[in-house]
């Protein structure tokens, strides 16, 4: 089964520093998202080989990429306290697959000693449940699609 290997599990960095997050899969992707988890998960980047990556305006100008969508390293620069959070890779395949998440702790330099990562990966409860079905249903499964609502509010 397809899975996403994500590293590191956790990293503590001072304000202004950079962090690398690596997402590796066995291939066969349409693309890969990096999402910051929370009550309203936020898309940070969408990366697809051969095209210009899509980057959230909050990170524009301070994010770099190396590798390919199958083995992608995302470098976030000039980190701010507000960037603290859990970031997860999501591979878009026939089945959507999530990485285990990277907890990024951005701290004031003088408080580095107070905030340290443990060796444990981020708690699974913080991650969305890995989906198990097809991202693009075949016509014969299309009856499972919800009816289009009359109106749908955007966040």
């Amino acid at each position: 089964a397809q899975e996403v290997q994500q590293s590191p599990h956790c990293t503590t960095v001072p304000v202004g520093a950079s962090v690398n997050i690596t997402c590796s899969t066995s291939g066969g992707l349409r693309g890969i998202y990096l999402r910051q988890l929370g009550p309203q998960p936020q898309d940070i980047i969408y990366y697809e080989d051969g095209v210009v990556p899509t980057t959230d305006r909050r990170f524009r100008g301070r994010i770099d990429f190396s590798g390919s969508q199958d083995n992608l390293t995302i470098t976030m620069h000039r980190l701010q306290l507000s960037d603290t959070g859990t970031y997860t890779c999501q591979a878009i395949t026939e089945v959507n697959v999530y990485g285990s998440g990277t907890l990024v702790l951005v701290t004031e330099e003088q408080s580095q000693g107070w905030h340290r990562c443990s060796d444990a990966p981020p708690r699974a409860s913080a991650l969305p449940a890995p989906p198990t079905g097809s991202a693009l249903p075949d016509p014969q499964t299309a009856s499972a699609l919800p009816d289009p609502p009359a109106a749908s509010a955007l966040p």
């Epitope: 969408y46 990366y47 210009v52 959507n96 198990t132 955007l154």
Partner: nanobody
Framework: DVQLVESGGGLVQPGGSLRLSCAFP????????MGWYRQAPGKQRELVGD???????NYADSVKGRFTISRDSAKNTVYLQMNSLKPEDTAVYYC?????????????WGQGTQVTVSS
């Protein structure tokens, strides 16, 4: 309330062309997979095709080589160019915007636009 707005449907003769548009009224357009689905009378809704945030399109076998999906991030709009139309393409066409957070399209839908292919 806000929703996707499709346009461009209508009556066309077999072999003709139409271009459908779907406007996304939100700033996050560039992160969404944009899909086109269709539903013919008495049939299940089916995928026509979709386009990734990066602009790579995927099509159902029944429309490959005839239909083209594109997106314009400056206009927050996705297009479905339909050429060599056949009577079996007659259906209501729906636009879907989906961030692929769940296992099936669950984001935002348009109200649908009718396409009728008939002589």
């Amino acid at each position: 309330d806000v929703q996707l707005v499709e346009s461009g449907g209508g009556l066309v003769q077999p072999g003709g062309s139409l271009r459908l548009s779907c406007a996304f009224p939100g700033s996050a357009f560039s992160f969404y997979f944009m899909g086109w689905y269709r539903q013919a009378p008495g049939k299940q809704r089916e995928l026509v095709g979709d386009i990734t945030p990066g602009g790579t399109a995927n099509y159902a076998d029944s429309v490959k080589g005839r239909f083209t999906i594109s997106r314009d991030s400056a206009k927050n709009t996705v297009y479905l160019q339909m050429n060599s139309l056949k009577p079996e393409d007659t259906a209501v066409y729906y636009c879907n915007a989906d961030r692929r957070v769940t296992i099936r399209p669950d984001g935002y839908w348009g109200q649908g636009t009718q396409v009728t292919v008939s002589s």
